[in-house]
């Protein structure tokens, strides 16, 4: 689903060819055909692996190759965040973590990678078959989310290969807005392209570009927002979900994690702009005003009121003694 | 309060081997990642590596493999760096941050000086 | 390993300047980028992350900006106090690895 598409050496004509007002709607068309080619979708790969010494603990990792600043990410299994999924774990870049048993710790790796492992006994203990999905919020792109699972025959410390996003799935932040610009952008490069092939011109200095330049990847995004909003979820044997999770605040956490809807991962405009959501169907899309975008889904057994969220103003570090020590 | 005390400075000859160490308070290092970092006198950081003290895995640049040791000891709260065959080379103030909680360096030990020298 | 090499080595400037650092990535490293200052005496501090997003109670003079594999990080008006060394680091793979520093001197 990673688009990096390679832009091929596009050569814009010299000044000199064209007088002032052709050079400039020349110029735009250049801009708009190297987004159009450079224009990708950001993908989400997932590892499963049991642990080799506890039989029936798991340790999930994911990751993010997008290009935009990670606003939250909801680690579920049982399915997609919104889609029947029960939600593990949230990371906050700047307001921490918060997990739901039986996750055991959550982290992150890197800036764009978080680790969770699940504890292995008990009632509410994963399985072989059970699916993980994580699911990053970000800015520009939206909200994506990938899910994975152990291969049926797993052996012990061993680790399913990282799963790049089997659900094709972005939010309309992403999807409608970057490329709908970039759409509409392409569309119109098309429009000038031809009227420019059928005005007599100057004879411009041909592009190096050859006839067989990456033009395909071009229209990812489209393509992504089509499959986004007609792909259905693949079916997802829940035979190992957990019972409905009560210890929503195990650690009495600060309030924002209790307002925190689990179903929803929102995208902050900074970070620390937030905003709740009303809750429609399953499926559904919510678009909100000043760029401020959420994944609507049910709303999952164990989760608390959809209250409006309040920064904490003394920042991150205030956050410690709840988050940070178990 | 969220700390991360290093070991004082230390002076060894070359050859020798030694341990520096990183408490924590007001957080339980299982929670993170426990990386270090060299700085010698006047030039940039360098990454060293990383524990995970859930379970002891470190991942080293392959530039310390075989010269760093990362463990953990989650008992008492503890990380600890050894450096071995030491050489004046390994001069340096080194550091232990903690990232995990949050995807970055958030709080960093207030380093411990290590002068190799005959 | 990712190299990032940042520009330039020292800067001398008056309070009330503008200073721009600029560091390279070898290879993209999408926006998994932080710089940090540090203090004579002192450990590293976080400025900014994601390449742009400012840390907590970090003044607003100081911002950064940046995608792929070249980054930047600008003080609007330097104060007194910006007296430090400032690094970039990325976390995009492993080896993590920063900048060679820049050290900003006020006249």
């Known amino acids: 689903m990673r688009t990096e598409a390679q832009v091929p050496a596009l050569q814009p004509p010299e000044p000199g060819l064209e007088g002032a007002m052709g050079h400039r709607t020349l110029v735009l068309p250049w801009v708009l055909l190297t987004l159009c080619v450079t224009a990708g979708t950001p993908e989400v790969w997932v590892q499963v692996r049991m642990e080799a010494t506890e039989l029936s603990s798991f340790t999930i990792r994911c990751g993010f190759l997008g290009s935009g600043s990670i606003s939250l990410v909801t680690v579920s299994w049982g399915g997609p965040n919104g889609a029947g999924g029960t939600t593990l774990a949230v990371l906050h870049p700047e307001r921490g973590i918060r997990q739901w048993a039986p996750a055991r710790q959550a982290r992150w790796e890197t800036q764009s990678s978080i680790s969770l492992i699940l504890e292995g006994s008990g009632a509410s203990s994963p399985c072989a078959n059970t699916t993980f999905c994580c699911k990053f919020a970000s800015f520009p792109e939206g909200s994506w989310e990938a899910c994975g699972s152990l291969p049926p025959s797993s052996d012990p410390g061993l680790s399913a290969p990282p799963t790049p996003a089997p659900i094709l799935r972005a939010d309309l932040a992403g999807i409608l807005g970057v490329s709908g610009v970039l759409l509409f952008g392409c569309v119109y490069l098309l429009h000038l392209l031809r009227r420019h092939k059928h005005r007599p011109a100057p004879r411009l200095q041909p592009s190096r570009t050859s006839p067989q330049a990456p033009r395909a990847r071009a229209w990812a995004p489209s393509q992504a927002s089509q499959a986004a909003l007609h792909v259905p979820y693949a079916t997802i044997n829940t035979s190992c979900r957990p019972a409905t999770l009560d210890t929503a605040h195990p650690h009495g956490g600060p309030s924002w994690w209790a307002s925190l809807p689990t179903h929803a991962a929102h995208r902050p405009q900074g970070p620390a702009a937030w905003a709740s959501t009303p809750i429609p169907a399953r499926g559904s899309f919510v678009s909100v005003e000043n760029g401020l975008y959420a994944q609507a889904g049910e709303r999952p057994p164990h989760t608390g009121p959809g209250l409006t969220l309040f920064p904490d103003p003394r920042g991150p570090r205030a956050m410690e003694g709840p988050l940070g020590v178990r | 309060e969220v700390q991360l005390q290093q070991s004082g400075a230390e002076l060894v000859k070359p050859g020798a081997s030694v341990k520096l160490s990183c408490t924590a308070s007001?957080?339980?290092?299982?929670?993170?990642?426990m990386h270090w970092l060299k700085q010698r006198p006047e030039q940039g950081l360098e990454w060293i590596g990383r524990v995970d003290p859930t379970n002891g895995n470190s991942e080293y640049d392959p530039r310390f493999q075989g010269k760093a040791t990362l463990t953990a000891d989650t008992s008492s709260n503890i990380a600890y760096l050894q450096l071995s065959s030491l050489t004046s080379e390994d001069t340096a103030v080194y550091y232990c941050a903690r990232f995990g909680i949050y995807p970055y360096f958030d709080y960093w030990g207030q380093g411990t000086t290590l002068t190799v020298s005959s | 390993s990712i190299v990032m090499t940042q520009t330039p080595k020292f800067l001398l400037v008056s309070a009330g300047d503008r200073v721009t650092i600029t560091c390279k990535a070898s290879q993209s490293v999408n926006k998994a980028v932080v710089w940090y200052q540090q203090k004579p005496g002192q450990s590293p501090k976080l400025l900014i992350n994601?390449?742009?997003n400012r840390y907590t109670g970090v003044p607003d003079r100081f911002t950064g900006s940046g995608y792929g594999t070249d980054f930047t990080f600008s003080i609007s008006t330097v104060q007194a106090e910006d007296l430090a060394v400032y690094f970039c680091?990325?976390?995009?793979?492993?080896?993590?690895?920063f900048g060679g520093g820049t050290k900003l001197e006020i006249k």
């Open positions: 680091q990325q976390d995009y793979s492993s080896p993590w690895t």
């Open positions: 007001g957080f339980n290092i299982k929670d993170i990642y």
């Open positions: 994601y390449a742009s």
